[in-house]
Amino acid sequence: LSVQQGPNLLQVRQGSQATLVCQVDQATAWERLRVKWTKDGAILCQPYITNGSLSLGVCGPQGRLSWQAPSHLTLQLDPVSLNHSGAYVCWAAVEIPELEEAEGNITRLFVDPDDPTQNRNRIASFPG
């Protein structure tokens, strides 16, 4: 089982849309795939895919999940808020027929505020 995640870095404006993609591949077929998205180590959602369908369509605040055969799991954040900034990781595990698991690399999401002055103040507030 292999998982490829993208993009590595994503910078979007507050109120717009962010799309994170996870490509899940396995040489042999699987009956049930458990997937998980985390943000800064905290679980956003942990649905499974079976018979070509996701058991859950929502994933965290303003997050929508979709599965496009053969291998694309998409997390769409819309609208994006400042709280969405963080490090996202996609994880997958084949539960049936045999346990296999893998995870993607981090996607770092940066959300710019609508007000550019707010952005300047935020950057200036970092120490040192």
Partner: antibody, heavy 120, light 113 residues
Amino acid sequence: QVQLQESGPGLVKPSQTLSLTCTVSGFSITTGGYYWSWIRQHPGKGLEWIGYIYTSGRTYYNPSLKSRVTISVDTSKNQFSLKLSSVTAADTAVYYCADMADKGGWFAYWGQGTLVTVSS
Amino acid sequence: DIVMTQTPLSLPVTPGEPASISCRSSQSLFSSNTKRNYLNWYLQKPGQSPKLLIYHASTRLSGVPDRFSGSGSGTDFTLKISRVEAEDVGDYFCQQHYETPLTFGDGTRLEIK
């Protein structure tokens, strides 16, 4: 250009262990998402999957041979190996190494094959 | 284990004529999760190792002549050669990768009449 090359003795005595090595060039066997495989073909017959080892080191064997097979990897030499114990004349075959990727599921590159004869 | 049954075992063909090889699996090779058939076709020319022709039942590998085509879904698959050429001689194998153990058909030997 990815190339695979089998090497090992062409003659093995019954009850002994058959040992073959596959040297991979043009590609690192530590690359994620690949299965390094062994397949054999009895003279004038079809193909039989022996097993493979995944990038993670996990092995998968054909149940018909599982008790006698070991597949391992030597990353420092970019090689993977097959050991088949307690051989009999029925193990006489051309042995191929090949690779398979998660993003496919087919055997993309094959070695040229090496004939191993089991005879005293 | 999934049993792959190929017919015919031998196929004599006149150059320029079409050829068809059938492959049947003992269980479905179609996944509703990935919408794929886990079935490949290989050609093994005399004295050579097998080479992939078709993957996922119907996708031709880049560089494979378009006279080769694959079709079918579930348990019944077909490899067709629209106009056989002398260089097409060899053994054709189907292979399933739906599950382990991976299994091959017994092969079809294509020969020129």
